[in-house]
């Protein structure tokens, strides 16, 4: 027989919300990915001492991870909605190869890494619908990505651990900057 509602005090229910707007959905999707990154970072930091390492610069030189710069129009000073949106989408597309690299880097969190990768693909789709100037978005070259992936996978264990840590940290920072910028749009 059906259990009457409210019988179990540990049930978690939220109020009935109105339909999500496009902006709300993007905002929530970014926060969803950030939550997933936290889970991956937790495993990385537990597994190695990379999170406290001061030798990051050595590995960072080999990586060309997307970063927000003043010219991208995403900061409060010199904010430009269209330029910034193009930067966010382009940056996310550039991060995809690094998220692919993460797929084989987690023993106990294989599905977690996959979830972060797939939820990022969904975010890119949401943002592409929002963008008016899709022509300005450059898609990374698949051949270049393939050779980058091979190069990253050929690194020694220490560098692979450092690369994993840097990707997660940079991706988190990029998403946080994107979230702040999108809230101004």
């Amino acid at each position: 027989a059906p259990v009457p509602p409210g019988e179990d005090s540990k049930d978690v229910a939220a109020p009935h919300r109105q339909p999500l707007t496009s902006s709300e959905r993007i905002d929530k999707q970014i926060r969803y990915i950030l939550d997933g990154i936290s889970a991956l970072r937790k495993e990385t930091c537990n597994k190695s001492n990379m999170c406290e390492s001061s030798k990051e610069a050595l590995a960072e030189n080999n990586l060309n991870l997307p970063k927000m710069a003043e010219k991208d129009g995403c900061f409060q000073s010199g904010f430009n909605e269209e330029t910034c949106l193009v930067k966010i989408i382009t940056g996310l597309l550039e991060f995809e190869v690094y998220l692919e690299y993460l797929q084989n880097r987690f023993e106990s969190s294989e599905e977690q890494a996959r979830a972060v990768q797939m939820s990022t693909k969904v975010l890119i789709q949401f943002l592409q619908k929002k963008a008016k100037n899709l022509d300005a978005i450059t898609t990374p070259d698949p051949t270049t990505n393939a050779s980058l992936l091979t190069k990253l996978q050929a690194q020694n264990q220490w560098l692979q651990d450092m690369t994993t840590h840097l990707i997660l940290r940079s991706f988190k920072e990029f998403l946080q900057s994107s979230l702040r910028a999108l809230r101004q749009m």
Partner: nanobody
């Protein structure tokens, strides 16, 4: 291996209520999205409602979304201790008759069946007039 199992379906009169349950086992990622979909005979599978879950305490945890056709009549909730998601259905109408499925994904705020990776077998709900 992720597994979902629904229960609680049955035959009910229009205006009545039912509470469906979905037990989730084997999930290894967080956050996650659990949704209820339904499929009436000869129709496409359609989204009913979703709830976000997280192993960390974030403000997304417990966030819900409903299809227009059920908003105000159906309520989704979950009990983490029992790894169970509930669908409380009230003021049922004959057009609510369908097989109800629960599904899980790690893709986020997605509301179409093809975005869901894991599915239960479904439970039949029949509303008579």
């Amino acid at each position: 291996q992720v597994k979902l199992e629904e229960s609680g379906g049955g035959l009910v009169q229009a205006g009545g209520s039912l509470r469906l349950s979905c037990v989730v086992s084997g999930r290894t990622f967080s956050p996650y999205t659990i949704a209820w979909f339904r499929q009436a005979p000869g129709k496409e599978r359609e989204f009913v409602t979703t709830i976000i879950g997280s192993d960390r305490s974030t403000d997304l945890d417990g966030d819900t979304y409903y299809a227009d056709s059920v908003r105000g009549r159906f309520t989704i909730s979950r009990n983490d201790a029992k790894n169970t998601v509930f669908l409380q259905m009230s003021s049922l109408k004959p057009e609510d008759t369908a097989v109800y499925y629960c599904a899980l994904t790690g893709k986020g705020y997605v509301f179409t069946p093809n975005e869901y990776d894991y599915w239960g077998q479904g439970t039949q709900v029949t509303v008579s007039s």
